[in-house]
Interface confidence: low
């Protein structure tokens, strides 16, 4: 069944956690719908971002941190392994130096740690899509 | 009660025809919602658009049309009279030679046509807001 | 439109527990995620717990571990489970529904009028 959307839960992050969601775009990539992840450092929707990653489907990514309120280097990558009007899984896993982000089973994206992923209190997902999977998994110590 | 979003209705517009909507933004202005209203000229979300209109909540407002596929010259505004977690109610009013924008009663915006509305046949509301009223009403003869 | 009223706040001793009980109107309450935020006299509205359309939840920091949160969509209830109450408890508890899940009192767009908690040492 679908989630809600925005769709926010309380999450710990570290080392070998997998963040997984599946979803699929509201409108066709003609129309630039967006898919906006967004870790956040507290359970409130203003607190800073440890990692912004935001699609505009069919036209681009863009990855970026907010610290003390104010964003900071954008970093942007053409890559679209997105299908107009088909599901996607998306895979976000904290690696020790980066985030490793998979899409459909293929590694796409990188972003390297600017903030410890500790720090991370609170994932949400929104913007243009539909959701039908949320899941945080923790590397078995 | 609440309209899903995407919402889309079909709709003939003319000199005299009101659109109307209510909603609210689903996120705080700092992190930039976005409410999107296109007058579409087929019940096809590819069509071409009479009048794209797309706030950026607390940041800029684009207009737009699209026409063969592609879109045309973009006009912007810095004006924003919507309120960060308020409820707005805007209105696009079909005037002989332009849509008229209210925002909470307040002309915010216009638009010269460069399709005639009679070519519009669907309005979709979509983006970063929760509906609460969608309503077209047509000038009396 | 969905109409919420909220039951079940009272007095009690510091320790003790309550039950509290939203009952919702409306053919749709099983398609809105629910909410429970308390606000205290003076102080900003706070967010206590949600549980999602499928009965996923989540809880603020401060009540982890003390509070349950559930739903009943036969019923068209949410109750909120109180235990081991503490006097920073007491305050106005209010049910909100919405068609996001979320922390944010914005994100919910039907409110009851709350009910009183009050905890004392």
């Known amino acids: 069944s679908l989630l809600p959307v925005p769709y926010t839960e309380a999450a710990s992050l570290s080392t070998g956690s997998t963040v997984t969601i599946k979803g699929r775009p509201l409108a066709c990539f003609l129309n630039e719908p967006y898919l906006q992840v967004d870790f956040h450092t507290e359970m409130k929707e203003e607190s800073d971002i440890v990692f912004h990653f935001q699609v505009c489907f069919g036209r681009r990514v863009v990855m970026n941190s907010r610290e003390y309120g104010a964003w900071k280097q954008q970093v942007e990558s053409k890559n679209m392994p997105f299908q107009d009007g088909q599901e996607f899984e998306l895979s976000i896993s904290v690696l020790p130096d980066k985030y490793q982000v998979m899409v459909n089973g293929q590694s796409s994206y990188t972003f390297d740690h600017r903030i410890k992923p500790e720090a991370v209190k609170m994932v949400q997902v929104w913007r243009d899509i539909s959701l039908t999977k949320f899941n945080v998994s923790y590397l078995k110590r | 009660s609440l309209l899903p979003v995407p919402y889309t209705e079909a709709a003939s517009l003319s000199t005299g025809s009101t659109v109307t909507i209510k909603g609210r933004p689903l996120a705080c202005f700092l992190n930039e919602p976005y409410l999107q209203v296109d007058f579409h000229t087929e019940m096809k979300e590819e069509s071409d658009i009479v009048f794209h209109f797309q706030v950026c909540f607390g940041r800029r407002v684009v207009m737009n049309s699209r026409e063969y596929g592609a879109w045309k010259q973009q006009v912007e505004s810095k004006n924003m009279p919507f309120q960060d977690g308020q409820e707005f109610e805007l209105s696009i009013s079909v005037l002989p030679d332009k849509y008229q924008v209210m925002v909470n009663g307040q002309s915010s915006y216009t638009f010269d046509h460069r399709i005639k509305p009679e070519a519009v046949k669907m309005v979709q509301v979509w983006r970063d807001i929760s509906l609460t009223k969608f309503n077209v009403s047509y000038l009396k003869r | 439109e969905l109409q919420v009223v909220e039951s079940g706040g009272g007095l009690v001793q510091a320790g003790g527990s309550l039950r509290l009980s939203c009952a919702a109107s409306?053919?749709?309450?099983?398609?809105?995620?629910m909410a429970w935020f308390r606000q205290a006299p003076g102080k900003e509205r706070e967010f206590v717990a949600a549980?999602?359309?499928?009965?996923?939840?989540t809880y603020a920091d401060s009540v982890k571990g003390r509070f349950t949160i559930s739903r009943d969509n036969a019923k068209n209830t949410v109750t909120l489970q109180m235990n081991s109450l503490k006097p920073e408890d007491t305050a106005a508890y209010h049910c909100?529904?919405?068609?996001?899940?979320?922390?944010?009192?914005?994100?919910?767009?039907?409110w009851g009028q709350g009910t009183q908690v009050t905890v004392s040492s």
């Open positions: 409306g053919r749709t309450f099983s398609t809105y995620s």
């Open positions: 909100a529904a919405g068609g996001t899940y979320s922390f944010v009192p914005r994100s919910y767009n039907y």
């Open positions: 549980i999602t359309r499928s009965g996923g939840n």
